[in-house]
Amino acid sequence: KSPIFGPQEVSSIEGDSVSITCYYPDTSVNRHTRKYWCRQGASGMCTTLISSNGYLSKEYSGRANLINFPENNTFVINIEQLTQDDTGSYKCGLGTSNRGLSFDVSLEVSQVPELPSDTHVYTKDIGRNVTIECPFKRENAPSKKSLCKKTNQSCELVIDSTEKVNPSYIGRAKLFMKGTDLTVFYVNISHLTHNDAGLYICQAGEGPSADKKNVDLQVLAPEPELLYKDLRSSVTFECDLGREVANEAKYLCRMNKETCDVIINTLGKRDPDFEGRILITPKDDNGRFSVLITGLRKEDAGHYQCGAHSSGLPQEGWPIQTWQLFVNEESTIPNRRSVVKGVTGGSVAIACPYNPKESSSLKYWCRWEGDGNGHCPVLVGTQAQVQEEYEGRLALFDQPGNGTYTVILNQLTTEDAGFYWCLTNGDSRWRTTIELQVAEATREPNLEVTPQNATAVLGETFTVSCHYPCKFYSQEKYWCKWSNKGCHILPSHDEGARQSSVSCDQSSQLVSMTLNPVSKEDEGWYWCGVKQGQTYGETTAIYIAVEERTRGSSHVNPTDANARAKVALEEEVVDSSISEKENKAIPNPGPFANEREIQNVGDQAQENRASGDAGSADGQSRSSSSKHHHHHH
């Protein structure tokens, strides 16, 4: 399938001009290669009319140009002084020959309709209203006023000043005068449909002295706006229907032959195909709203329509806006797993892609909620503290960088199952959706911490050990101290790594962390995890409580496992009280409904990352003179 996209059908009238925009994939080669516009002949040959190499055919001389806009990945063909001879089949394309990548465009140029001279032509969109102005001479002021619509032979009454109204205009047409002006009457017709288009005659008075005015009403379907999006990216349909429908229910539907199937509306309807990846957001009191769809699939391509009606369904004679969505399969967004599976009590590490050109953008993770219009409350972000109910079990690591950050969620329950979004305050196309499935655990977890009821005594030494299976032998093990700004990696000691790599004793694979001396600030959540380079794997969490020594007793670590733990060698120590920038309030609330939720993250000002990002191991460090790790507070 060609990745070039443009308008399928373009129509105009003689003497007018057209502007045709064609889209191409965002690559350096495409930006620089030849762009062309050619006309298809009966033989299948496509004859170049204009190209970006400077070629201009004789029939286009002085009336056409082709402009490349590499920054938008589009090129535009402008053609003026159209004649009916321009009607035909064309291609816009890329490549050194006209057999390159292309898109078929049909151009239809029709004759200017012959109208009686001095006809007033009104052009309005479907669903809107028009006020036809009917001037008359003062002497006809007392006479009957009327508006009729011309049919083949006669003129069928629409409305008159005696309050006669054609049945198909009842509730839609009204005839009135304004103020003291006795030389014009007006007819307003609302909820315009295609059937209302045509010639009308206004009349004041009867017989030869009557005043008549010819009116041509053109009712147009809105031109579809072209949207060119990459596979797996996201799209926002911005719908602006005007104040007159501000209080009506809104919808977005997709054309399916003759009908338009509702995908989502503000009355709670949602197509199951879009579960977890769609939001509808009322913008303001002026009838504006937007629909955001993430994780675009190739089958999402098509013709979309938004509208407003109390039923939340498409209705003739109500305003609409339309789009043609093209999903480019040559996507720059990496193909990641869209479903992540975890087990109760276990953990998941989710790799979130972002535009690699925007490494300093703020990263977020939100949970899609389908109630109401759908929203996505932020659970964690580079400068957004972790939501309280996720305390101790959620962290965002702004690594490995170069296009990926990691979100880790542990202590999983079946309630965690659902849809989550990765998003940044940068390029909004890179919003991605992950479905998390959580099954009941059927075996012991891979990582186990001892002691499990961890209570450390103030001023003493306390060691916790994390047991891991042999399959994690070659992976890097780490301990980190969790805070609502991230999980800061601590120095730890891997006991298993001392063994010969030939055999692996399942019972002695452990990584230990020692607190010496224990201080009150050491209380909190700690994670033990594994990773391979910057790819994070499983984690498990433990809460360490700190209490004062009871008089007359000395504290002994409660398990044999801790007795096996060797003290860590002297090494650089990470201070657990890394200074962080204050959490910034996130502006512009919306689909992400409370003050911690984000709407147009793409519109937010770019902010640099906090110096101590979640998951970063570089905080303020100091070395220790002891053989155990000290946390200096």
């Epitope: 109208l115 001095d118 006809t119 007033h120 032509v121 009104y122 052009t123 028009v130 006020t131 102005e133 001037p135 304004k178 014009v184 007006y186 307003n188």
Partner: nanobody, 120 residues
Framework: QVQLVESGGGLVQAGDSLALSCAGS????????MGWFRQAPGKEREFVAD????????GYADSVKGRFTISRDNAKNMVTLRMNSLKPEDTAVYYC?????????????WGQGTQVTVSS
């Protein structure tokens, strides 16, 4: 046919107001739907606002909705564009246009233009 002359342009500060007028002569003014268009340096001419023959239908560009108001007085052969809360991006030459047969206005007849400059 109608001849059009614009007036009222000038240099103002951002946030200020200005009113442009367009006087028509040479034909019955109510025979024409009227409009305002503008052209900023290096840009295409763009639609601003228009009004039908007797003022019952009015249209505005999204960029000026709520800030600009168009009105007409057929007795005085005049169309006026009141511009409030002006922004630097409103800087342009403003043209008055008339159309005998069409609303929205396409622009069969044009004035010479009046310069509006909005400084920040």
């Amino acid at each position: 046919q109608v001849q059009l002359v614009e007036s009222g342009g000038g240099l103002v500060q951002a946030g200020d107001s200005l009113a442009l007028s367009c006087a028509g002569s040479g034909d019955t003014f109510s025979n024409y739907a009227m409009g305002w268009f503008r052209q900023a340096p290096g840009k295409e001419r763009e639609f601003v606002a228009d009004i039908s023959w007797y003022g019952a239908n009015i249209g505005y560009a999204d960029s000026v909705k709520g800030r600009f108001t168009i009105s007409r007085d057929n007795a005085k052969n005049m169309v006026t564009l009141r511009m409030n809360s002006l922004k630097p991006e409103d800087t342009a030459v403003y043209y008055c246009a008339a159309d005998r047969n069409h609303w929205p206005v396409k622009g069969d007849y044009w004035g010479q233009g009046t310069q509006v400059t909005v400084s920040s």
